[in-house]
Interface confidence: medium
């Protein structure tokens, strides 16, 4: 008789989720020298012991500490790069612009990109038919955890001038409830970050109107302010074109026109 | 922050060279476009050139072209411009000014160097 | 290159008034989607300041009696109502293509 098993309101473990975060650990610690030391089967070892046996609504930062502990990374503090909402084009900045990092460009980030995953209460297997909804069931579910936890220590790691593309083409272009917006901006250190700068990324072709004026932004250049940090905003009309000028900076074009 | 700050002005004979740094500060200097315009005294701004974020390409108004070399050093967040055979009509206060990539503006400027060129 | 050329040389304003300055490209400086035009203010004594890009964006920080208007080859720079901290030289400069030209100027004074 199959036993019963909680159904939540979201999707459930990703498939093949243990191979694929140590395949990903493999690959992270082959291309980053700076990490090699780093043991993949303790990492796996310490990912699984945050949330398996554990009820996934009651999962706490201090479950990841033993990862977060395998997983310390030295990125270089003035080359951080927040996103909120627009995480695709965050990626193919990095990608472009190699001296910054996102969180998804450190180890830990990288592991559990795109990723979904959630254990039982008093048993130690992993369920693959569903996991709590933030919403819907409950915040302190294990993926939530991970990327609240995750995200305050990449907040706090920055320092002098940090950098954050926002969605342009959302109603809220900068969002309290994102976890840009409730974690990130919150776990700044005045001390060392001097100036928060927003790039607001458009998505209409010929949307010409400067949304750095946007109520949102200056909501969140008051919530900055007040924390003791300077803030700026620019506008990037057109990311393809500004992507592209990243990537080839001798282009002509790459003055006028963008 | 965002600080730029020239300095290596000074008086210089027709025909000499001289060469002036901008230092910057509070921002990214790598990611950045960065210019040197000009102010003859009394007179109105004249764009003299900009450099890419890699150096891979400088850009120069055509009556300073071989006149004037712009370069710079992004591990030391330094700015330069290189001036050959100065005339006393390149007199002036030389300003750098940050380029800001999406729009084509100058949306930071030092506070100028100023070269006096005299015998 | 383009040419920018703006009018008047001077300027004399009341405060509170409205003070109007011109520029026009002597080709366009616009594309289907934007006019690369910027405004600069240069009090005396101190180096230009960004006004407007892109032909009506204020810069942050900049009071909202600054606005641009324009496309093509005409653009304007309205202040209203003036103010005494007005009194500076302003400059239009083009980016649509190299090399990058300014306009010779405007001189605001208040009557």
């Known amino acids: 008789v199959p036993r019963w098993r909680q159904q939540w309101s979201g999707p459930g473990t990703t498939k093949r989720f243990p191979e694929t975060v140590l395949a990903r650990c493999v690959k992270y610690t082959e291309i980053h020298p700076e990490m090699r030391h780093v043991d993949c089967q303790s990492v796996w070892d310490a990912f699984k012991g945050a949330f398996i046996s554990k009820h996934p609504c009651n999962i706490t930062e201090e479950d990841y500490q033993p990862l977060m502990k395998l997983g310390t990374q030295t990125v270089p503090c003035n080359k951080i790069l927040l996103w909120s909402r627009i995480k695709d084009l965050a990626h193919q900045f990095t990608q472009v612009q190699r001296d910054m990092f996102t969180l998804e460009d450190t180890l830990l980030g990288y592991l559990a990109d795109d990723l979904t995953w959630c254990g039982e209460f008093n048993t130690s297997k992993i369920n693959y038919q569903s996991c709590p909804d933030w919403r819907k069931d409950c915040s302190n579910n294990p993926v939530s955890v991970f990327w609240k936890t995750v995200s305050r220590r990449f907040a706090e790691a920055a320092c002098d001038v940090v950098h954050v593309m926002l969605n342009g083409s959302r109603s809220k272009i900068f969002d309290k409830n994102s976890t840009f917006g409730s974690v990130e901006v919150h776990n700044l250190q005045p001390e060392k970050v001097q100036t928060l700068e927003a790039w607001v990324i458009h998505g209409g072709r010929e949307d010409s109107r400067d949304l750095c004026q946007d109520p949102t932004i200056k909501e969140l250049e008051s919530i900055i302010s007040k924390r003791n940090i300077q803030f700026s905003c620019k506008n990037i009309y057109r990311p393809d074109k500004f992507l592209q000028c990243v990537k080839n900076p001798e282009d002509s074009s790459c003055t006028s026109e963008i | 922050q965002v600080q730029l700050l020239e300095s290596g002005g000074g008086l210089v004979q027709p025909g000499g060279s001289l060469k002036l740094s901008c230092v910057a500060s509070g921002f990214d200097f790598s990611l950045y476009w960065m210019n040197w315009v000009r102010q003859a005294p009394g007179k109105g701004l004249e764009w003299i050139g900009k450099?890419?974020?890699?150096?891979?390409?400088?850009n120069y108004t055509p009556s300073l072209k071989d006149k004037f070399f712009i370069s710079r050093d992004n591990a030391k967040n330094t700015l330069y411009l290189q001036m050959t055979k100065v005339r006393s009509e390149d007199t002036a206060l030389y300003y750098c000014a940050r380029l800001w990539i999406a729009t084509g503006g100058f949306d930071y400027w030092g506070q100028g160097t100023t070269l006096t060129v005299s015998s | 290159e383009i040419v920018m050329t703006q009018s008047p040389a001077s300027l004399s304003a009341s405060l509170g008034q409205r003070a109007t300055i011109s520029c026009r490209a002597s080709?366009?400086?616009?594309?289907?989607?934007?006019?690369?035009v910027h405004w600069y203010q240069q009090k005396s004594g101190q180096p230009p300041k960004l006004l407007i890009y892109l032909a009506s964006n204020l810069e942050s920080g900049v009071p909202a009696r600054f606005s641009g208007s324009g496309s093509g080859t005409d653009f304007t720079l309205t202040i209203h109502p003036v103010e005494s901290e007005d009194v500076a030289t302003y400059y239009c400069h083009h980016s649509r293509e190299l090399p990058f030209t300014f306009g010779s100027g405007t001189k605001l004074e208040i009557k």
């Open positions: 450099i890419n974020p890699d150096s891979s390409t400088i």
């Open positions: 080709s366009s400086v616009s594309s289907s989607a934007f006019s690369y």
